[in-house]
């Protein structure tokens, strides 16, 4: 599953919640990032999260003629230099810093399952999807297509606005 | 390689109904979404909607929503649009679309159909 | 709903020619921006998305460029077989809206 380009294709930057609209928040602990799933209240301002779109080949079409089989990779960023990463070991998901070119951990495929909602899926571990678990993001085993409507990989994108990359 | 085949023209009366087709090949049908967008003298091109045969998840542009039905069969790899109390102006050529990426709507349109053309007289 | 407004609504030129259209936004769409090519009793076929991304097989003759609202897709050295209604789309959010087409033809 290879990037095709280095530089992104589109950026985004965005406030993510969950499908049951809690907020995804980031906090910055004993000089490291905690993610938490929380209900905001009314006032209270959303993180927000750059999302940098790369496109990949598919990996069953990478010897094929390249017009078909075309993927969307995403990298999400909430602040300067740290990234979401998969620790596929720990089943986890953690805040990074990380200098271009990103580890694979960096990157997730991306997934409409519905029009309004997103599913991050590790790219170092097919079928593992960024999750919500106990109030916290973790990596959340889906074993068949079926399955990937279910709710607590299904996440919200309120765009802010456009990032303008050069 | 990837193709989009649709139905042939149609003449319906005023006030019917019609369902069209669009049959599929060269790709995985399950793992891409369909669009459909209309071509008329009037109004130029105008997206109606889209479908994502994995979950029959749907989304339509508001002028289309009591319009345009989409249904998909899996087990054929076709997705179908049906347009339901016709009016003049619903004369147009209708085609099915599919974006450029795997499991994702950009709502691009990389590969079209034909196109299918509706006329509706009395 | 974002309009999408395009200029000239039709040119003639000569092959060989530069040609550069333009693509107005009512509002800020980032690069979500594609451009399609549609000759007479054809589907249209896309040429730009991602406002500069040329598609897979598109000549490298046509350059997409611009962000925000304000849009431009350009073809260097025109050939005969570019004679054709070219339409820009805002892309990513619902609804995507077209621009009502610049028509290209031959002298």
């Known amino acids: 599953m290879s990037i095709t380009g280095i530089s992104p294709i589109t950026e985004y930057l965005a406030s993510l919640s969950t499908y049951n609209d809690q907020s995804i928040t980031f906090a910055l602990e004993d000089e490291s990032y905690e993610i938490y799933v929380e209900d905001l209240k009314k006032d209270e301002k959303k993180d927000k999260v750059l999302l940098s779109y790369y496109e990949s080949q598919h990996p069953s079409n990478e010897s094929g003629d390249g017009v078909d089989g075309k993927m969307l990779m995403v990298t999400l960023s909430p602040t300067k230099d740290f990234w979401l990463h998969a620790n596929n070991k720990e089943h986890s998901v953690e805040l990074h810093k990380s200098e271009k070119p990103l580890p694979d951990q960096a990157f997730f495929v991306l997934h409409n399952m519905h029009s309004n909602s997103v599913s991050f899926e590790s790219k170092t571990d097919p079928g593992v999807f960024i999750g919500v678990k106990d109030n916290h993001l973790a990596l959340i085993k889906v074993d068949s297509s079926e399955n990937l409507s279910t709710e607590n990989i299904l996440f919200k994108l309120s765009e802010t606005h456009h990032h303008h990359h050069h | 390689q990837v193709k989009l085949l649709q139905s042939g023209a149609a003449l319906v009366k005023p006030g019917a109904s019609v369902k069209m087709s669009c049959a599929t090949s060269?790709?995985?049908?399950?793992?891409?979404?369909v669009s459909w967008v209309k071509q008329s003298h009037g109004k130029g091109l105008e997206w109606i909607g889209e479908i994502y045969p994995n979950s029959g998840a749907d989304n339509f542009n508001e002028n289309f929503k009591g319009k345009a039905t989409l249904t998909v069969d899996k087990s054929t790899s076709t997705a179908y649009m049906e347009l339901s109390r016709l009016t003049s102006e619903d004369s147009a050529i209708y085609y099915c679309?599919?974006?450029?990426?795997?499991?994702?709507?950009?709502?691009?349109?990389?590969?079209w159909g034909q196109g299918t053309l509706v006329t509706v007289s009395s | 709903n974002i309009v999408m407004t395009q200029s000239p609504k039709s040119m003639s030129i000569s092959v060989g020619d530069r040609v550069t259209m333009n693509c107005k936004a009512s509002?800020?769409?980032?690069?979500?921006l594609a451009w399609y090519q549609q000759k007479p009793g054809q589907s249209p076929k896309l040429l730009i998305y991602y406002a500069s991304n040329r598609y897979t097989g598109v000549p490298d003759r046509f350059t997409g460029g611009g962000y925000g609202t304000d849009f431009t897709l350009t073809i260097n050295s025109v050939q005969a077989e570019d004679a054709a209604f070219y339409y820009c789309?805002?892309?990513?959010?619902?609804?995507?809206?077209f621009g009502g087409g610049t028509k290209v033809e031959l002298r």
């Open positions: 509002q800020n769409v980032g690069n979500n």
């Open positions: 789309q805002r892309i990513y959010n619902s609804p995507p809206t």
């Open positions: 060269g790709f995985s049908f399950t793992d891409y979404w």
């Open positions: 679309t599919r974006g450029p990426y795997y499991y994702s709507t950009q709502i691009i349109f990389a590969y």
